[in-house]
């Protein structure tokens, strides 16, 4: 009987010889539980596990805590991989996070964090980031130090408001902070002066809602 090979992330998939972009089945660390993820095997050397993608507004990102925990959407299009998987994965070894952004004028930019991990659910999947480089702003648009994750039914932000209800989507809101890549998707010519759009403040400023975003992770020693 042939032993089935399991992969923890897209870097392991890549190293096994699968170097084509696409959806692969990954396995939770120290578990048999599986999850489907999109692997980018071309960008920057490949081996990237896509943990978030926005591109056309086809998926509703105003979801519950549980949905953000387990993931939602379609890995071939707009989706959220799932906080629980990402938390478990990024606590096994050191990962980098690359955030790729597109605006409506044809420009692209990225933010690269040399160390990224999420705390456990008990700590509200708090985000931890170090070492920012890239073209999408010299200051991190994800507030530092990192904040707890908040959703419409899980209010962990610092605002007297509920950021997830005000701005829509689950995110590591501060009060409410300079970014929200899970905000409302606004089409071209409707994407300015939107306080609840897809925001990366230190690249495009206040009120600009982006055309496309991708969040991807890869082991630091890849």
């Amino acid at each position: 009987k042939e032993e089935q090979i399991s992969f923890r992330d897209c870097a392991e998939v890549f190293k096994s010889g699968h170097t084509t972009n696409g959806i692969y089945t990954l396995t939770f660390p120290n578990s048999t539980e599986e999850i489907k993820a999109y692997c980018d095997m071309e960008a920057g050397g490949g081996g990237w596990t896509i943990i978030q993608r926005r591109e056309d507004g086809s998926v509703d990102f105003q979801r519950t805590w549980k949905e953000y925990k387990v993931g939602f959407g379609n890995p071939s299009g707009e989706y959220w991989l799932g906080n629980e998987f990402v938390s478990q994965l990024t606590n096994q070894q050191r990962y980098v996070l690359k955030i790729h952004l597109k605006d409506w004028e044809g420009n692209e930019a990225y933010s690269l964090y040399e160390h990224f991990y999420l705390s456990s659910e008990e700590l509200n999947y708090r985000i931890h980031l170090k070492g920012l480089t890239g073209t999408a702003g010299k200051i991190s648009s994800i507030s530092q130090p990192g904040n707890d994750f908040s959703t419409k039914d899980g209010d962990n932000d610092k605002c007297i408001c509920k950021c997830s209800q005000m701005l829509t989507g689950g995110w590591w809101f501060d009060a409410c902070g300079p970014s929200n890549l899970n905000g409302m998707y606004y089409p071209q010519r409707q994407n300015t002066n939107k306080f609840n759009g897809i925001k990366w403040y230190y690249w495009k400023g206040s009120g600009y809602s982006l055309k496309a975003t991708t969040m991807m992770i890869r082991p630091a020693d890849f």
Epitope: I160, C163, M166, Y201
Partner: antibody, heavy 120, light 108 residues
Framework: EVQLVESGGGLVQPGGSLRLSCAAS????????IHWVRQAPGKGLEWVAG????????YYADSVKGRFTISADTSKNTAYLQMNSLRAEDTAVYYC?????????????WGQGTLVTVSS | DIQMTQSPSSLSASVGDRVTITCRAS???????VAWYQQKPGKAPKLLIY???SLYSGVPSRFSGSGSGTDFTLTISSLQPEDFATYYC?????????FGQGTKVEIK
Amino acid sequence: EVQLVESGGGLVQPGGSLRLSCAASGFTISDYPIHWVRQAPGKGLEWVAGGTPAGGYTYYADSVKGRFTISADTSKNTAYLQMNSLRAEDTAVYYCARFVFFLPYAMDYWGQGTLVTVSS
Amino acid sequence: DIQMTQSPSSLSASVGDRVTITCRASQFLSSFGVAWYQQKPGKAPKLLIYGASSLYSGVPSRFSGSGSGTDFTLTISSLQPEDFATYYCQQGLLSPLTFGQGTKVEIK
């Protein structure tokens, strides 16, 4: 028509207590946070406290924490500010205001104010 | 606590003048949480601008707000006699809520 009417102000000795009332009409106070803002004579605006007590959200300025308490009686559509251990520096006109939690995200309606004087 | 530093603290201007008041926050603020109020002596404050730049219902269009991040501005394009008052910026995001110290607009 939305209206807020404060009452309960007056002269009180240091260490004394007062309860201010904010009677609302034109809206239901359980639907909106009520905030309290004060203004000492000749000074600027200072936020004191606010929130939705029924919903478990209450916030206080450090200067009044432990001495002031906000509450509400939804049957009377009235919010209250209980002020204990009053000090001379609490002397001010006190305003209640409705805080809208969507748009406009601001205090859109204010009461006329009630004067609290703390003096011996 | 977030400090809201307003400038100038007072200014003298004539009817028809363009007046600009600035407010600097001590840390990043989501624009939707910044408001401007007008207060006349012996009266309660009135909301002018919310969300840093949106004109509140019934407020004349000569008032406008702008800014983002930490720097916000209130502009009166052509000062009218009824505009002589004190103006306050305010952040409503983090407890304690904080106001600027006020800008008194006086007749020159």
